[in-house]
């Protein structure tokens, strides 16, 4: 799996999970989240050569097409596969609210 | 939806469905498929600015991050959303076989 265990150790050129820490205030301009101040969002990036973790038959076809027609610029892209939620604390007035924001943390990637 | 009805008419710079005809023999080197000789595979391409057809909360976060940190190069990617199968005819010896290859045709796109 193109997850942290593999990708953070192997710093792979091909599609892989990349670490990305996001500070809510500084990086997103969000002041409404009280805790946490930021989180390890991660993201997916890297090349998608033929058969590198292809998601569908179409992405396999597209990467093969791109191998044979490298000038074509029609190639699969490295995107998130498994995502996890993030629990946040914010306030409405003086009332604390705890909420789970779905699909906030990328855990693994694929070529799609 | 970022499908043919919208994208083929609007020639959109942002993430959208793009037409792509693939000739099995010429473009993939596949000689085993007897019919069809090729098909409209289509593909997804284009920019993913903030809130342009974002797939998940993470892709929304990432595109906002990229807006505020344009030098960061961590942005969502335009990938396939809905896919359809393709029916093909091939031969095993002299015996014709009809098979449905799943996820061969892209019908719409998303920023993921």
């Amino acid at each position: 799996a193109l997850d942290a265990a593999y990708c953070f150790r192997n710093v792979q050129d091909n599609c892989c999970l990349r670490p990305l820490y996001i500070d809510f205030k500084r990086d997103l301009g969000w002041k409404w989240i009280h805790e946490p101040k930021g989180y390890n969002a991660n993201f997916c990036a890297g090349a998608c050569p033929y058969l590198w973790s292809s998601d569908t038959q179409h992405s396999r076809v597209l990467s093969l097409y791109n191998t044979i027609n490298p000038e074509a610029s029609a190639s699969p892209c490295c995107v998130s596969q498994d995502l996890e939620p993030l629990t946040i604390l914010y306030y409405i007035g003086k009332t604390p609210k705890i909420e789970q924001l779905s699909n906030m943390i990328v855990k693994s990637c694929k070529c799609s | 939806a970022l499908d043919a009805a919208y994208c083929f008419r609007n020639v959109q710079d942002n993430c959208c469905l793009r037409p792509l005809y693939i000739d099995f023999k010429r473009d993939l080197g596949w000689k085993w498929i007897h019919e069809p000789k090729g098909y409209n595979a289509n593909f997804c391409a284009g920019a993913c600015p903030y809130l342009w057809s974002s797939d998940t909360q993470h892709s929304r976060v990432l595109s906002l991050y990229n807006t505020i940190n344009p030098e960061a190069s961590a942005s969502p990617c335009c990938v396939s959303q809905d896919l359809e199968p393709l029916t093909i005819l091939y031969y095993i010896g002299k015996t014709p076989k009809i098979e449905q290859l799943s996820n061969m045709i892209v019908k719409s796109c998303k920023c993921s």
Partner: nanobody
Framework: QLQLVESGGGLVQPGGSLTLSCLAS????????MSWVRQAPGKGLEWVSV????????HYSDSVKGRFAISRDNAKNTLYLQMNSLKPEDTAVYYC????????????RGQGTQVTVSS
Amino acid sequence: QLQLVESGGGLVQPGGSLTLSCLASGFTFSHYPMSWVRQAPGKGLEWVSVIGSDGAIKHYSDSVKGRFAISRDNAKNTLYLQMNSLKPEDTAVYYCAEGDSRYVRNRARGQGTQVTVSS
């Protein structure tokens, strides 16, 4: 809060050597790849090198390949950059960054350390 503190810069003659250090805190250092980036006067951030979380795999930009060596000590939460055969064009402020800076140009989290190569 994630913090990175770079040190070890200075003035050195062409052909000389320096070793930069980066002390990390506020995150699990041993879990993450780490990078060195640099910013020459009037230029943008340039990726220099990246090292995998366990230190086994390393990549370098073409401009420093064969001259610079990245390493890490996970027990000490410290990243290093051994710089040999220094050239005037290596003059820059050097920053360490969490993650793989080939793919994401994080805003500098440390203050950086100035390296000046001049005779």
